[in-house]
């Protein structure tokens, strides 16, 4: 999806970046995650988003659009207040629903243009519309309250372009699936791998007997089990090979010396 | 074996209403596991997505901006099928259509695996 | 919407050859990549998904790879009923969107 013009180019372009680091090539590092991150490019003085893969990479990597701004960016926030102030809803806030094809379970909200409120909804994780928000608070900020907003609705990117799987959007999310916490899994930093892996066997609700096949993450391996025909979750394979490849590419060996946190 | 079959006039005026339907067979319209689209293709434009439909407890509709205020796409469970409309037709709409599958959605992949022959529709007064 | 470009658009090869098309998105889209094979009066076949599975029924002389924006299509040893329109699809954005295709002709 395009990104949508930055207002402030024009005006910030040719000014040099606050701090060295906002110099530095994207990074996405030599682990495997799957992180959306944002990083200013030099080249086009923007702040854009890329893919992180959750380990190593430089100082030039932000969670949000607007920590990139805020941080690379000379002048960005006087500039922002100021295009706030006539700010105007977004055509994308009237788009309704779509939780996307596929089958993730992902809190999400959307502005719902009959209620004329955000509501919370569930996104599947891909190819979904783009009145979707990680959080109220953004919801609220781009499509209800738009006039009151702090940042202008002209800096809604990528980060509010959330239709694919392929991107998270924090260091708690992989495909935009919160990650389950749980003693009886390899810690999250062990695991780089999409995030339902580590979800338990689950044969679901209906009456149906199908063999499929889950990652069990204690031991590494793909199992099978009766999976009822509907309801579940998403660690579930029609293939031991499916499942492996799914799912047993994410465990990395902790190469590190000291305690993760 | 999943089938997709196409049905369609293949000559429509212009300004007038595009219409094919998609029969599936081997699969349901409904179910969860998948969704069912249209994609066209041109000389000019290559494969192009028009727009697909899925079931997840309700129906949902996802469409191309090129054309989304001229599309509609319906299922038909009754039928197990499911229908392309595109008004107001050009003679840039000229194109072969295909109906077809996204499938893999329960193993973290989507693909469209499988498809309909082909319908070429020519706008043309 | 992302640009998907294919290079080469045509490629003259004999039988027995080792072909390479590549695929480059205009923006990350991890592995998020399909492969699809066209024949002349033909839907397109899936080949690969997911930037380097293999679809059911399709022989092990097709492979697939890369990530980020660069992928591969690799044929090992190219057959007569290879010949064909090769197409890539991105299906991490919303469009999903397809390249512009490869034809493998016959030398």
């Known amino acids: 999806l395009s990104e949508e013009a930055d207002d402030t180019d024009s005006e910030l372009g040719s000014m040099k970046p606050l701090h060295t680091f906002c110099a530095m090539k994207a990074d996405d590092g030599p682990c495997k995650a799957m992180i959306r991150s944002y990083f200013f490019n030099m080249y086009t003085h923007q702040c854009e988003e890329f893919i992180y893969g959750g380990c190593e990479g430089n100082e030039n990597r932000f969670d949000t659009l607007e920590e990139c701004k805020k941080t690379c960016i000379p002048g960005y926030e006087k500039t922002a207040v100021k295009a706030a102030s006539g700010a105007e809803r977004p055509d994308f806030c009237f788009l309704e629903e779509d939780p996307g094809l596929c089958r993730g379970y992902m809190k999400r909200y959307l502005y719902n243009n009959q209620t004329k409120q955000c509501e919370r909804f569930v996104y599947g994780g891909c190819l979904g519309n783009r009145n979707n928000f990680e959080t109220l608070d953004e919801c609220k900020k781009i499509c209800e309250n738009p006039v009151h907003s702090p940042s202008p609705v002209n800096e809604v990117q990528m980060s509010d372009y959330v239709t694919d799987g392929n991107t998270v959007t924090d260091r708690s999310t992989v495909n935009n699936i919160v990650v389950p916490q749980s003693p009886k899994v390899p810690r999250r930093r062990d695991y780089r791998g999409r995030p339902w892996c580590l979800q338990p066997a689950d044969s679901g609700l209906c009456k149906a007997s199908e063999r499929r096949f889950y990652y069990n993450s204690a031991t590494g391996k793909c199992h099978r089990f009766n999976y009822t025909g509907c309801g579940g979750n998403n660690n579930n394979f029609t293939t031991r090979r499916r499942c492996l490849r799914s799912c047993k590419t994410g465990l990395i060996k902790n190469k590190s010396k000291g305690v993760v946190k | 074996q999943v089938q997709l079959q196409q049905s369609g006039p293949g000559l429509v005026k212009p300004s007038q209403t595009l219409s094919l339907t998609c029969a599936i067979s081997?699969?349901?319209?409904?179910?969860?596991?998948?969704?069912w689209g249209w994609i066209r293709q041109s000389p000019g434009r290559g494969l192009e997505w028009l727009g697909h439909?899925?079931?997840?407890?309700?129906?949902?509709?996802s469409y191309a901006v090129s054309v989304k205020s001229r599309i509609t796409i319906n299922p038909d469970t009754s039928k197990n099928q499911f229908s392309l409309q595109l008004n107001s037709v050009t003679p840039e709409d000229t194109a072969v259509y295909y109906c077809a599958r996204w499938g893999g959605i329960h193993d973290g992949d989507i693909y469209f695996d499988y498809w309909g022959q082909g319908t070429l529709v020519t706008v043309s007064s | 919407d992302i640009q998907m470009t294919q290079s080469p658009s045509s490629l003259s090869a004999s039988v027995g050859d080792r072909v390479t098309i590549t695929c480059r998105a205009s923006?990350?889209?991890?592995?998020?990549l399909n492969w699809y094979q066209q024949k002349p009066g033909k839907a397109p076949k899936l080949l690969i998904y997911g930037t380097s599975s293999l679809q059911s029924g399709v022989p092990s002389r097709f492979s697939g790879s890369g990530s980020g924006t660069d992928f591969t299509l690799t044929i090992s040893s190219l057959q007569p009923e290879d010949f064909a329109v090769y197409y890539c699809?991105?299906?991490?954005?919303?469009?999903?969107?397809f390249g512009q295709g490869t034809k493998v002709e016959i030398k």
């Open positions: 699809q991105q299906y991490g954005n919303n469009p999903t969107t």
């Open positions: 923006q990350n889209i991890s592995n998020y």
């Open positions: 081997g699969d349901s319209v409904s179910s969860n596991g998948a969704a």
């Open positions: 439909i899925y079931y997840r407890s309700k129906w949902y509709n």
